[in-house]
Amino acid sequence: IVGGTNSSWGEWPWQVSLQVKLTAQRHLCGGSLIGHQWVLTAAHCFDGLPLQDVWRIYSGILNLSDITKDTPFSQIKEIIIHQNYKVSEGNHDIALIKLQAPLNYTEFQKPICLPSKGDTSTIYTNCWVTGWGFSKEKGEIQNILQKVNIPLVTNEECQKRYQDYKITQRMVCAGYKEGGKDACKGDSGGPLVCKHNGMWRLVGITSWGEGCARREQPGVYTKVAEYMDWILEKTQSSDGKAQMQSPA
């Protein structure tokens, strides 16, 4: 996160850290807990990496430096990458992770509500992006979970800023015209959440952008509301019944 500040314990209890252990262990992506056994993240997190074996998912944590060999983590039972996702393209950048064992909810580890299917009418004015990613373009993973308040940008405005790319209705953009605050590498897959009527909802999944926090280059996020059918289909077909945290 560029231009962010430290988060507090329990402030974003749905935030998880996706880590890979090959020779060394490292944080690669964020993710959002959406049910006892389900995490929503970005498909591109898995580019070039093996599925299942090497991944460790840490939930209910604030500081990555607190992780030791004794820190409990979840392992992956199944990774479901959107069938239309193509490597090095920004479309359909969404993936579901089914955990091997369900997680108990606590004050520090509980799910984020999902938006309604095709939610286009809600005007979100209080949106935040969180993660342990770089604090500058060529930076390093941060120890303490960072948060930053970023306004949504219309798709029309976003398309003007990305004339070489197609900003689809299944994407949502967020950023300041002057730049300075944004997600960055290592934040991918993490949540863009907005508070509406006193409730936090998962509006976007951190996906891509031209650099980080550049002037007139907003961050681009996968629009979760546009994938509700897919999320429900995949979680129900795997579980037999949905265990998602849907909005009231």
């Epitope: 090959l22 690669l28 580019d47 070039g48 990496l49 599925l51 590498k185």
Partner: antibody, heavy 122, light 106 residues
Amino acid sequence: EVQLLESGGGLVQPGGSLRLSCAASGFTFSWYTMVWVRQAPGKGLEWVSYIYPSGGATFYADSVKGRFTISRDNSKNTLYLQMNSLRAEDTAVYYCAMGSYDYIWGFYSDHWGQGTLVTVSS
Amino acid sequence: QSALTQPPTVSVSPGQTARITCSGNKLGDKYVAWYQQKPGQSPMLVIYQDTKRPSRVSERFSGSNSANTATLSISGTQALDEADYYCQAWDSSIVIFGGGTRLTVL
């Protein structure tokens, strides 16, 4: 210790086919992206192709696209390169390499085989 | 698919610092690796992620990358450093190598 051993090179006529193999040992093969890189005599390194750990995604240089096919058999710890419609300009030493890749840091190859020579000539 | 440009040759006196450049459009936005290749041998990774050095590589090797140019520096150059050096970057699923630089120790 990581070991990569290429085989299958040799002399082939233009338009012919060849299949290269790369036997891997000393690491968990199924965890890593694998790559083929070639070097024409007296020339520099040229990327040919790479393949994801599961084999689910493959990528090719424009110069070989549609003619070469990369594949892997994780149960045999072996990487392959099927080369069809070979041309004189494909003459090179072909190296197999183990790739380190993720979306944050990009791609680099930290272990290389000794290479196998492919000569395309009539 | 952008190209990476290296000088064909660089010469240096023993004990001096050799600097080999690699230039490309917005190269500073990408992470660069460097490989050393001695005659008749396979390439060997000497720098990755712009500045990191594998444990088996001498501390005399260092890297930097900003704007449009990445640089491999070899301090206290020795005769054993004579080799071809290649830069490499990754861009939108494409692996790109520079044309290579022959380092000669005078």
